[in-house]
């Protein structure tokens, strides 16, 4: 069986300030079991944007129903974009662990650029 891949098809997305940005992410397998998280940036300074397992992320909606059986689409939409949202977003698969989940594989990233709101 092929190892899971995290696919972020768009290298970049450009959105006007105030609009919503859709960031696409798909998995090639349901295994290993574990949550998906989205981050802005990489390394220690990365910002948690969405955690499938816990938390309240009011500006983020999932494009498909993540709890649906056999779902492999983990795309998200971020509303009301501002210049501070610009950056590279990574879709990251975690493997279920105890006590903490372990990062398993990351997508290649999608760079979000924010255009000035048209006047």
């Amino acid at each position: 069986e092929d190892e899971l891949q995290v696919i972020q098809p768009e290298k970049s997305v450009s959105v006007a300030a105030g609009e919503s940005a859709t960031l696409r992410c798909a998995m090639t397998s349901l295994i290993p079991v574990g949550p998906i998280m989205w981050f802005r940036g990489a390394g220690a300074g990365r910002e948690l944007i969405y955690n499938q397992k816990e938390g309240h992320f009011p500006r983020v909606t999932t494009v498909s129903e993540l709890t649906k059986r056999n779902n492999l689409d983990f795309s998200i939409s971020i509303s009301n974009i501002t210049p501070a949202d610009a950056g590279t977003y990574y879709c990251v698969k975690f493997r279920k662990g105890s006590p903490d989940d372990v990062e398993f594989k990351s997508g290649a990233g999608t760079e979000l650029s924010v255009r000035a709101k048209p006047s």
Partner: antibody, heavy 119, light 108 residues
């Protein structure tokens, strides 16, 4: 209910150090960025520092850069502010504040801890 | 760096009357503006976010409006317990997070 409780305030001399703590409860602490905001006697609110959800990304106001260090322990649901080389102008009530999302306003505030720097 | 200017510095209003507070940004902040209330000796409390959305548990006499650079907080029928300092906060550009200088609302 979200609760933020600061401790560690007190009276110190110029040049001395102090560490503030903020115990958080009632929300998924590890999913949210946290901030310190201060208020000098009779003055307005001044943002001091921010730390991202994972603890690896930090930002500081110019007035405290190089002297203050923000950190967090997600296993203990606690936020810290290490204050070194304290000055008279650092005298203030220090509030810890939860951020609504990674790029957002402060939706919950602690009761504050008074720090007095005086010779 | 975005500067927020609040006016007036002090507002004296009779109970039951309308209070209108202004916050002006030096550059556009879209709708990314919040209002916080601070009563004497207490911590700040979030009232309004995204310029016009009331936070949980905030009475409907508080309303926010505006976008871009000009924002207004309105207290439609002032109650004695509304005596406080009100601060606006922008979160469109950061760091740093910026607050306005505050408007003190007094009861006549």
């Amino acid at each position: 209910d979200v609760q933020l409780v600061e401790s560690g305030g007190g009276v110190v001399r110029p040049g001395e150090s102090l560490r503030l703590s903020c115990a958080a409860s009632g929300f998924s602490f590890s999913s949210y960025a946290m901030n310190w905001v201060r208020q000098a006697p009779g003055e307005g609110l001044e943002w001091v520092s921010r730390i991202n959800s994972g603890g690896g990304g930090t930002d500081y106001a110019e007035s405290v850069k190089g002297r203050f260090t923000i950190s967090r322990d997600n296993s203990e649901n606690t936020l810290y502010l290490q204050m070194n080389s304290l000055r008279a102008e650092d005298t203030a009530v220090y509030y810890c504040a939860k951020q609504y999302d990674w790029n957002g306003f402060f939706d919950y505030w602690g009761l504050g801890a008074l720090v007095t720097v005086s010779s | 760096e975005t500067v927020l200017t609040q006016s007036p510095a002090t507002l004296s209003v009779s109970p039951g009357e309308r209070a209108t507070l202004s916050c002006r940004a030096s550059q556009t902040v879209g709708s990314k503006l919040a209002w916080h209330q601070q009563k004497p000796g207490q911590a700040p409390r979030l009232l309004i976010y995204d310029a016009s959305r009331r936070a949980t548990g905030i009475p409907d006499r508080f309303s926010g409006s505006g976008s871009g650079t000009d924002f207004t907080l309105t207290i439609s029928s002032l109650q004695t317990e509304d005596s406080a300092v009100y601060y606006c906060q922008q979160y469109y550009y950061w760091p740093p997070y910026r607050f306005g200088g505050g408007t003190k609302v007094e009861i006549k």
